[in-house]
Interface confidence: low
């Protein structure tokens, strides 16, 4: 079931949609570019992406600091209940933009900006990322991470935009965790009805990769819930 606003938007955002993404970035001074394409079902909350490092590969840091920028940032694919306005779907055809800061427990910082638009029936994502201050002996530069735990992004309106906050946890090869505090501001390119506070439960998985992580496939499932909802559904 979809809301009235989404119903009107279904002519623009179909049941099945593709996207293209281009990322340019640097981490601790190492510059790189990544291109990718993906597809998914915006009203069901699922998406997959195939990504390729086109410049600067193989990357001398863990892929996991990049993975959320492709999918946690691909917000048109979040499933929403009918009574929560889907601010980011409703932003199309004009689209939206976001910026994010990820503060890692060892002082590493990732800052990201992204522009989401619609061209010829496909989403187009342009991403710029900068990672700084990652210790050379830490889990990111030593590539000791093993993917993200499921997480819940707390969403709420403020200053005419939609804010998101997550406490994210990366699994480590030694069995421990590496934590990040993530804050994102999502802003539609036109006036759009903002929802009240709610949560988006997210599970992101690397489904395949080559040995040096220059080709990676990802899958994400994401669903908006009223603030009481748990994350059990993501594991089904």
């Amino acid at each position: 079931m979809v809301s009235k606003g989404e119903e009107d938007n279904m002519a623009i955002i179909k049941e099945f949609m593709r996207f293209k993404v281009h990322m340019e970035g640097s981490v601790n001074g190492h510059e790189f570019e990544i291109e990718g394409e993906g597809e998914g079902r915006p009203y069901e909350g699922t998406q997959t992406a195939k990504l390729k490092v086109t410049k600067g590969g193989p990357l001398p840091f863990a892929w996991d600091i990049l993975s959320p920028q492709f999918m946690y940032g691909s917000k048109a694919y979040v499933k929403h209940p009918a009574d929560i306005p889907d601010y980011l779907k409703l932003s199309f055809p004009e689209g939206f933009k976001w910026e994010r800061v990820m503060n890692f427990e060892d002082g590493g910082v990732v800052t990201v900006t992204q522009d989401s638009s619609l061209q010829d029936g496909e989403f187009i994502y342009k991403v710029k990322l900068r990672g700084t201050n990652f210790p050379s002996d830490g889990p990111v530069m030593q590539k000791k991470t093993m993917g993200w735990e499921a997480s819940s992004e707390r969403m709420y309106p403020e200053d005419g935009a939609l804010k998101g906050e997550i406490k994210q946890r990366l699994k480590l090869k030694d069995g421990g965790h590496y934590d990040a505090e993530v804050k994102t501001t999502y802003k539609a390119k036109k006036p759009v009805q903002l929802p009240g506070a709610y949560n988006v439960n997210i599970k992101l998985d690397i489904t395949s990769h080559n040995e040096d992580y220059t080709i990676v496939e990802q899958y994400e499932r994401a669903e908006g819930r009223h603030s009481t909802g748990g994350m059990d559904e993501l594991y089904k």
């Epitope: 933009k97 976001w98 910026e99 994010r100 800061v101 910082v109 800052t111 900006t113 522009d115 710029k128 403020e158 200053d159 935009a161 804010k163 804050k183 501001t185 802003k187």
Partner: nanobody, 124 residues
Framework: QVQLVQSGGGLVQAGGSLRLSCAAS????????VGWFRQTPGKEREFVAA????????NYGDSVEDRFTISRDNAKSAVYLQMNSLKPEDTAVYYC??????????????????WGQGTQVTVS
Amino acid sequence: QVQLVQSGGGLVQAGGSLRLSCAASGRTFSDIAVGWFRQTPGKEREFVAAISWSGLIINYGDSVEDRFTISRDNAKSAVYLQMNSLKPEDTAVYYCAARIGMNYYYAREIEYPYWGQGTQVTVS
């Protein structure tokens, strides 16, 4: 530490325009989010406009939207406030303020640890 030096301001007739500048030093400028606030005697500081570290996210106070424009030039380490269609009620001391990293709550002055010296704008 971030040092902020303001310029611009002065006396202008109603309906006129002014541009305020805020130059920053002491930190990589692209790491800094900047806001503008204003204050009239006996009143609290009022949020005017803010621009994020990336320049991607911009917000305005209700009373200035559609008349004022905030912009940034990272090459010059400066943020500008272009004020058009000025009204007598825009008369105030204007302050630029900065924070390192993401400015998440744009309109809250407590979010900004660094402040410029203030510049007087008088609209007659």
